[in-house]
Interface confidence: medium
């Protein structure tokens, strides 16, 4: 009897070069084959779980950066007057929750602020969970 | 043929609000549906593997702070003189193991320490091992 | 009817006590049970997907660590001038992958350089998808 | 196919006003800067004013400052310049441009301010 | 403001032969995460300006590769490796590391 194979994990990885002052980071998935889906600059959570989430990036000027997950909670991450990032974290997401950046920057420019090797990473950790597609 | 489903995996979240000087952080899991669980103030280890692990909180006083899993073992964490932490982990633990905190404060106050946003995560990497229930 | 079982996952620790100036760490595996191998001093990629990578150790001297996982490609770490490394990381490896450590120090010294602690754990996040063994 | 239309260039006096728009197709406009570039007649190329994305951040050039203003609405894909107190020294084509690095342009809008 | 100042300010080449042109800063244009801002833009007779280089060398969308950028510092340089027709117009370097954007005088390139 053959066994049983894995279904796919719920994962994604998703590149940004640049950042838009009072708004947030604009995502750009490179690989057609991801399980998860980004919708309007947002990653989509469509299951449950803990998620392993990894954020890298250096940055053209000094911002204040926050990753959200959902209208009225606190962020998955808040770095503070930064040039560069390189964190990861540990959280618990649920269907519905969309995850997206918020930034901020401290000049009074107009320009974009450019990223270099802008990287989000989600990785569902609880397969098996509720999901709903 | 339905695709086979995954068993749950062994992950835990336990908050903690209080810790006590030289003793550990008293620890309540918030959800019902933990697939760990918490006894004598300790998360019990069932299943052989890597652990995924995740420590968070802010601290009423300055502290020094351990995670232990095992008697006579080094910590899993081990910070000094910290009014905070945000830690990331990884760490082989098996059947038997108990993770737990041993908390030293450095003030003659016999007060508890007061913890915002205390959070412990665990989530087991190798499904498919060995555990005992 | 008994729930399926997972495959085991692929993941492997392992440790290293010396590094070799321009050379890199020499690691063996504690463990007959790993699911993945080290071969000419290099872990062996079989399996496409994210990994959880932690890297830890205290070094005797003051050295540049990186680890490399593709020829021509940046490292996975990369650290300059340190007595010791923590690190968590998360990368895309592939089958044909081979992730090995490049150490140089800034000493004249023809020693190696000793380590305490040193040890390097990979676990795959993405079972499922493609292995080749 | 991204595309920039320009229209509100116009004569109009000194001292006058003009209020130039342009609307934007082909890409997401709420996610990009925009700006207005000028070119006087057989001169080169000046950046008037830029606009960030949310419409929060605004640039202006020293000789326009307090007299031009830039605006947007995303809704209608539009970026606007509102001249008032125009000067012989405003005559010009001014063109819309994509992002603050100007990697597209539209096919611009005469100004002519003249008595 | 940063000045930037082109060489020559017309230049008359034949069809087939190569063209360079100069710009030159005022101050050195610094790195931002190891990008040069250093642009350079083609405007035709009776059109709009058409950026064609972006970050010091790199071809935008649709931009021959006879059009290369290059250099550092102060000093960078337009080439064209076989000039045609097509290419008559005016040639425009700018800058963006600082603001405002500022942009050289111009370089008419005519065809012989």
């Known amino acids: 009897q053959v066994p049983p194979q894995y279904p796919p994990i719920q994962s994604i990885r998703v590149q940004f070069t640049r950042c838009e002052n009072e708004k947030g980071c604009i995502i750009t998935s490179p690989s057609k084959d991801e399980t998860m889906k980004v919708q309007d600059n947002s990653i989509i959570i469509n299951c449950d779980g803990f998620y392993l989430i990894s954020l890298k990036g250096y940055f053209s000027e000094e911002l204040s950066l926050s990753l959200y997950y959902r209208k009225g909670r606190g962020p998955l991450f808040s770095l503070s007057k930064v040039t560069s990032v390189d964190s990861i974290g540990v959280a618990y997401l649920a269907f519905k929750d969309k995850v997206y950046f918020n930034v901020t920057t401290h000049s009074t420019s107009y320009k974009d602020i450019q990223v270099n090797g802008g990287e989000l990473i989600l990785i569902h950790q609880n397969p098996g969970g509720f999901c709903a597609y | 043929q339905v695709p086979p489903q995954y068993p749950p995996i062994q992950s835990i979240r336990v908050q903690f609000t209080r810790c006590e000087n030289e003793k550990g952080c008293i620890i309540t899991s918030p959800s019902k549906d933990e697939t760990m669980k918490v006894q004598d103030n300790s998360i019990i280890i069932n299943c052989d593997g890597f652990y995924l692990i995740s420590l968070k909180g802010y601290f009423s006083e300055e502290l020094s702070l351990s995670l232990y899993y095992r008697k006579g073992r080094g910590p899993l964490f081990s910070l000094s003189k910290v009014t905070s932490v945000d830690s990331i982990g990884v760490a082989y633990l098996a059947f038997k193991d108990k993770v737990y905190f041993n908390v030293t404060t450095h003030s003659t106050s016999y007060k508890d320490i007061q913890v915002n946003g205390g959070e412990l995560i665990l989530i087991h990497q190798n499904p498919g091992g060995f555990c005992a229930y | 009817q008994v729930p399926p079982q997972y495959p085991p996952i692929q993941s492997i620790r392992v440790q290293f006590t010396r590094c070799e100036n321009e050379k890199g760490c020499i690691i063996t595996s504690p463990s007959k049970d790993e699911t993945m191998k080290v071969q000419d001093n290099s872990i062996i990629i079989n399996c496409d997907g994210f990994y959880l990578i932690s890297l830890k150790g205290y070094f005797s001297e003051e050295l540049s660590l990186s680890l490399y996982y593709r020829k021509g490609r940046g490292p996975l770490f990369s650290l300059s001038k340190v007595t010791s490394v923590d690190s968590i990381g998360v990368a895309y490896l592939a089958f044909k992958d081979k992730v090995y450590f490049n150490v140089t120090t800034h000493s004249t010294s023809y020693k190696d350089i000793q380590v305490n602690g040193g040890e390097l754990i990979l676990i795959h996040q993405n079972p499922g998808g493609f292995c080749a063994y | 196919e991204v595309q920039l239309v320009e229209s509100g260039g116009d004569l109009v006096k000194p001292a006058g006003s003009l209020r130039l728009s342009c609307v934007a197709s082909?890409?997401?406009?709420?996610?990009?800067?925009m700006s207005w570039v000028r070119q006087a007649p057989e001169k080169g190329l000046q950046l008037v004013a830029g606009i960030n994305s949310a419409g929060s951040s605004t640039y202006y050039t020293d000789a326009v400052k307090g007299r031009f203003t830039i605006s947007r609405d995303n809704a209608k894909n539009t970026v606007y310049l509102q001249m008032n107190s125009l000067r012989a020294e405003d005559t010009a084509i001014y063109y819309c441009a994509k992002r603050w690095v100007f990697d597209y342009w539209g096919q611009g809008t005469l100004v002519t301010v003249s008595s | 403001d940063i000045v930037m100042t082109q060489t020559p300010l017309s230049l008359s080449v034949s069809p087939g032969e190569p063209a360079s042109i100069s710009c030159k800063a005022s101050q050195s244009l610094p790195h931002s995460l190891g990008n040069t801002y250093l642009y350079w833009f083609r405007q035709k007779p009776g059109q709009s300006p058409q950026r064609l280089i972006y970050?010091?060398?790199n071809r935008d969308p649709g931009v021959p590769d006879r059009f290369s950028g290059s250099g550092s510092g102060t000093d960078f340089t337009l080439r064209i490796s076989r000039v045609e027709a097509d290419d008559a117009g005016i040639y425009y370097c700018?800058?963006?590391?600082?603001?405002?954007?500022?942009f050289g005088q111009g370089t008419k390139l005519e065809i012989k």
């Open positions: 970050k010091v060398s």
């Open positions: 700018g800058q963006g590391i600082q603001d405002p954007f500022t």
């Open positions: 082909g890409f997401t406009f709420s996610s990009y800067s």
